[in-house]
C-alpha cells in the first residue's frame, strides 16, 4: 500500500490524524465496523489536546470512542495501553451499571454531553468518531 499523505474528503485533519464525525447513531460494534471498513478505527484519545479537539467537533452529544472492556480489561481498539494512557472519566465512572435491565453491565465508553467519559450498554445507538493516522500505509494498492 501507499502512505496516506492527506485526509479523505469529509474528514478533518488534526495533528497528523484524520477524523470523521458521524451524524447518525449506531451500536458500538456497528460503529467499530464502519470505521474498519474505512481503513480507520474508532477514535483513540491519547492526550488532553486531542480530547479538546474531538469534544469541540462533537458538541454535547453522546458519542462512541474506541474503548471497551467487553472481555474484562479496558482496551483501546488500536492497542494503545489503557493503564498508562490518558483517561477522562466522569466522576463515579466507569461503574459497569447493571440497573438498566438490558442484561449485562456497561462495556463500551462514550463521550458524554460535557466531554467526559462514561461506560454504557454497547447496543445503544450513539454517534461515533473514526480516526486514521496520516502516516500509516493505506490498504489501497499503489497506482501503477
Amino acid at each position: 500500500g501507499s502512505e496516506r499523505t492527506c485526509c479523505p474528503v469529509n474528514w478533518v485533519e488534526h495533528e497528523r490524524s484524520c477524523y470523521w464525525f458521524s451524524r447518525s447513531g449506531k451500536a458500538w460494534a456497528d460503529a467499530d465496523n464502519y470505521c474498519r471498513l474505512e481503513d480507520a478505527h474508532l477514535v483513540v484519545v491519547t492526550s488532553w489536546e486531542e480530547q479538546k479537539f474531538v469534544q469541540h467537533h462533537i458538541g454535547p452529544v453522546n458519542t462512541w470512542m474506541g474503548l471497551h472492556d467487553q472481555n474484562g480489561p479496558w482496551k483501546w481498539v488500536d492497542g494503545t495501553d489503557y493503564e498508562t494512557g490518558f483517561k477522562n472519566w466522569r466522576p463515579e465512572q466507569p461503574d459497569d451499571w447493571y440497573g438498566h435491565g438490558l442484561g449485562g453491565g456497561e462495556d463500551c465508553a462514550h463521550f458524554t454531553d460535557d466531554g467526559r467519559w462514561n461506560d454504557d450498554v454497547c447496543q445503544r445507538p450513539y454517534r461515533w468518531v473514526c480516526e486514521t493516522e496520516l502516516d500509516k500505509a493505506s490498504q489501497e494498492p499503489p497506482l501503477l
Partner: antibody, heavy 115, light 107 residues
Framework: EVHLVESGGGLVKPGGSLRLSCAAS????????MNWVRQAPGKGLEWVSS????????YYADSVKGRFTISRDNAKNSLYLQMNSLRAEDTAVYYC????????WGQGTLVTVSS | DIQMTQSPSSLSASVGDRVTITCRTS??????LVWFQQKPGKAPKRLIY???SLQSGVPSKFSGSGSGTDFTLTISSLQPEDFATYYC?????????FGPGTKMDFK
Amino acid sequence: EVHLVESGGGLVKPGGSLRLSCAASGFTFSSYSMNWVRQAPGKGLEWVSSISGSSSFIYYADSVKGRFTISRDNAKNSLYLQMNSLRAEDTAVYYCARVAALDYWGQGTLVTVSS
Amino acid sequence: DIQMTQSPSSLSASVGDRVTITCRTSQGINNYLVWFQQKPGKAPKRLIYAASSLQSGVPSKFSGSGSGTDFTLTISSLQPEDFATYYCQQYYSYPFTFGPGTKMDFK
C-alpha cells in the same frame, strides 16, 4: 501483570467477625468492579458480593446480606469483605476476582467457622 | 435468580477424547456466560468469556458456543492436564450464579 492477593482468613467462632483484604496490582484498580466468590470444602463456587469501581453500586448474595459488607479503597488498591455474625456454613475459601466475568482471581484465603 | 444446570455432573474420559459439557440457564442470558477450569487446591481459571470467546493464553482445543439458555464447552482432544472440574457462570444479572460443576476424571 494483574495480581490479586487475599489475606485475613483464619479460624473464628460462630457469631464472630473477620475482615478479609485483597491487594490488587498491575491494573488501574478504580476502573474495575471487583467481586468476592467463595467455595466451601468439596463444594462448588458461590458468588458472594460485588462492588463497582467507585463504590456506587454494591450487590450481595441473599445468603450473606445484612451480615457481610464489601468495600474498597482505591487509593490503596485494596478490596475488603467485613464478615459479621459468622456461621458454620460460611466456612470456605474466599477469592477476590476482577469484573463481572471474573477474568482474574486471587489464590484464596481460608475462613473456618467452628467452635 | 437465574438457575444454572450443568451436565454431566461427572465424566470419565480418556486422553485424546473429544468432550462436550452443557450448561443451561433458567432464563435467556444472551451471551453473558463464562467457563472456568479448576484444579484441586487452585483458583479457577477462565477459559471462555462471552459464551464463545477464547481467553488469551488458553489453548484453542477449548471452544465455547451457545446463546440464550443453552451453552456448551468443548475440548477437542483431551490431554492429561485437562482433567479437572469445569464450571459455567452467568453475568447477565445479579446475583451472579454458577453451575454446579462437571468433574472430569480418567476412564
